[in-house]
């Protein structure tokens, strides 16, 4: 029987290779092969300071695969020099291009600086470099721009430490002075460029209607049309303050809805340093300013100030333990100032204003006290003005300012009130200043 032999066919196929890829300038290709056929792939990597782009669009990685029709499934990207783009603007400052005009590419250098006199740079030295990751970065590694913080405690006033009272203030003497209207007349002191420090009792009645507070800065005459208007975004009354039951913790903060522009007539007061108590000892001179009642019993038209000495705490406590002031209302959170002979004092309408002291080391003024309360008859002999002792509240102040933000939002919406409340029976043995 004859054997049948069939055809033996061997199929061989050569996959159509893809065009040989050429790495883009400032990039390299991997893996390098003699040829690339079906399912072979390559990746492109850029040199440091260059980034993968398809047109304007960034890519983190790139790989192309050879398809069966002999074409690559992706077009070749480019390796473009990293461009950090225009640096962020610096409020109250400026930016200078060091490498060259408008040069914002890899390794370019810029220098931020703050407006002289009234602002100082926080965080770093202001020098930033465009790094390979595309971010402007400081020598400390920060990606966000520095901050121009207002210089505090500048005053046109030169003090010789003499005690004299009831003086008219001149422009720039008390640039932190804030006039608060909306209920009764009260005062406050500017902190940074969007906070006002005041007394809790001065704004307590407006606590749920903070947006009604008419806040004026840069004013010298109480009724003058020349002032900078500000409005409250939020009010923070110390949670330990109880209205009409003594004046412990008589402190509040108002957050303004916009930052104010700092100039010679509007400058914040400094908060006390740890060492500040050495400038607030008994007989050290502080200065209180305001538009409160004068000796004639009327609200002052012009901003007035009085230089008064710190009074020994025990002496002050004793003065308010005598009838008709008995009740021991002077606490460790208060300080007293005034003359034993009387005649120089803060008074109604001065409430919330700052009692300021000169820091002899920094030559800047700082807030040591907040006008709080005193005897029914201002400037009474043997009685003293009582002030909230600000140094006891530095953690409280800093906590609120850090938690509730530096910059005013400038947005709409109603002003907020933040605090904890427990009302006690009213006590009337002394008056609000």
């Amino acid at each position: 029987m004859a054997s049948m032999t069939g055809w033996k066919i061997h199929y061989t196929s050569t996959a159509q290779p893809c065009p040989y890829p050429m790495a883009p300038p400032n990039g390299h290709l991997s893996p390098v092969q003699a040829k690339y056929i079906l399912k072979d792939s390559f990746s492109i990597f850029c040199e440091p300071g260059y980034e993968l782009l398809q047109g304007h669009l960034p890519l983190k990685s790139f790989a192309a695969v050879c398809q069966k029709d002999g074409s690559w499934d992706q077009p070749m990207p480019s390796c473009s020099i990293v461009d950090c783009g225009p640096p962020d603007d610096l409020p109250s400052g400026r930016v200078e291009y060091i490498t060259g005009p408008e040069v914002t590419t890899y390794k370019a250098v810029i220098q931020y600086s703050c407006e002289e006199t009234f602002y100082t740079m926080k965080v770093n030295d202001g020098k930033y470099v465009c790094e390979a990751d595309g971010f402007w970065t400081s020598s400390k590694g920060e990606r966000s721009p520095p901050v121009c913080e207002p210089v505090c405690g500048l005053s046109a006033r030169t003090t010789g430490g003499r005690i004299y009272g009831g003086q008219k203030a001149k422009p720039g003497d008390f640039p932190w002075q804030v006039l608060i209207l909306g209920g009764s007349t009260a005062a406050g002191a500017l902190l940074y460029d969007n906070w006002v420090l005041t007394a809790a009792h001065a704004i307590y009645e407006q606590k749920h209607d903070a947006s009604s507070l008419d806040i004026r800065l840069g004013a010298l005459k109480r009724l003058s049309p020349h002032y900078t208007q500000a409005w409250a975004e939020a009010v923070f009354i110390h949670e330990g303050y109880t209205h009409d039951a003594g004046f412990d913790n008589d402190i509040a903060l108002i957050k303004l809805n916009n930052k104010v522009v700092i100039n010679s007539n509007i400058t914040p007061i400094c908060l006390p340093r740890k060492e500040a108590e050495s400038f607030m000892r008994t007989d050290d001179i502080g200065t209180a300013s305001g538009w409160g009642l004068t000796q004639r019993g009327l609200l002052a038209r012009n901003l007035m100030y009085v230089d008064i000495p710190i009074v020994d705490h025990q002496k002050c406590t004793a003065a308010y333990e005598k009838p008709p002031y008995s009740g021991g209302s002077v606490t460790a959170n208060m300080l007293c100032a005034g003359l034993e002979s009387g005649g120089k004092d803060s008074c109604r309408g001065d409430s919330g204003g700052a009692l300021v002291f000169l820091d002899n080391e920094t030559q800047r003024w700082f807030v040591g006290g907040i006008v709080s309360w005193g005897s029914m008859n201002c400037g009474e002999a043997g009685q003293y003005g009582v002030y909230t002792k600000v140094i006891n509240y530095i953690p409280w102040i800093k906590n609120i300012i850090s938690n509730f933000g530096g910059g005013g939002s400038g947005g709409g919406g109603s002003a907020k009130f933040v605090a904890a409340w427990t009302l006690k029976a009213a006590a009337h043995h002394h008056h609000h200043h």
């Epitope: 398809q54 047109g55 669009l57 960034p58 890519l59 992706q74 077009p75 595309g134």
Partner: antibody, heavy 114, light 107 residues
Framework: DVQLQESGPGLVKPSQSLSLTCTVT?????????WNWIRQFPGNKLEWMGY???????SYNPSLKSRISITRNTSTNQFFLQLNSVTTEDTATYFC???????WGQGTTLTVSS | DIVMTQSQKFMSTSVGDRVSVTCKAS??????VAWFQQKPGQSPKPLIY???YRYSGVPDRFTGSGSGTDFTLTISNVQSEDLAEYFC?????????FGAGTKLELN
């Protein structure tokens, strides 16, 4: 599968701020690509607003630069659009998209009206 | 800004026809052009990127061509589901810009 979903208020008053969220599923926004906001006005004109890249860098349309901010939350895999001081001219359908443009959200319609 | 001009706002076609939608850039954009299809009430659907690369899942009757300033989207053998608005888009230069769109309608 990669999916993008926009969410927002629908109605905003003039001068207020608009905030929109794009929630991405099926792909990490830090892995690659640029994550964009694009809007389409009545009449179908499309406008690219800006993007935030996988690295967190942003790029904005200069016509909006003073009003726009694009941010992200990498832990929730979301990116956000904030547009300040809106006017009736900002009435549009807002889309988020992954670029290369291969994935788009369904869009959210925003009306600016008092 | 680069202007992407789609000179024809409307184009009429019939099922089975071949139609070409054109787009002209005001300056060189290389091959960094994409095409999108949009139907009423829907988001734009990506068709073509880098002038001539089809996105996955896009039927091969859609082809893109051109580079520099002149770009074309060609639909061979038009289907009824292709009746939509088509946008070109450049992503070569900041800011990214779109054409005004060309609506494909039935004859």
């Amino acid at each position: 599968d990669v999916q993008l979903q926009e969410s927002g208020p629908g109605l905003v008053k003039p001068s207020q701020s608009l905030s929109l969220t794009c929630t991405v599923t099926g792909y990490s926004i830090t892995s690659d690509y640029a994550w964009n906001w694009i809007r389409q006005f009545p009449g179908n004109k499309l406008e690219w607003m800006g993007y935030i890249s996988y690295s967190g860098r942003t790029s904005y349309n200069p016509s909006l630069k003073s009003r726009i901010s694009i941010t992200r939350n990498t832990s929730t895999n979301q990116f956000f659009l904030q547009l300040n001081s809106v006017t009736t001219e900002d009435t549009a359908t807002y889309f988020c998209a992954r670029y290369w443009g291969d994935y788009w959200g369904q869009g959210t319609t925003l009306t600016v009206s008092s | 800004d680069i202007v992407m001009t789609q000179s024809q706002k409307f184009m009429s076609t019939s099922v089975g026809d071949r139609v070409s939608v054109t787009c002209k850039a005001s300056q060189n954009v290389g091959s960094n052009v994409a095409w999108f299809q949009q139907k009423p009430g829907q988001s734009p659907k990506p068709l073509i990127y880098s002038a001539s690369y089809r996105y996955s899942g896009v039927p091969d009757r859609f082809t893109g061509s051109g580079s520099g300033t002149d770009f074309t989207l060609t639909i061979s053998n038009v289907q009824s589901e292709d009746l939509a608005e088509y946008f070109c888009h450049q992503y070569n230069t900041y800011p990214l810009t779109f054409g005004a769109g060309t609506k494909l309608e039935l004859n």
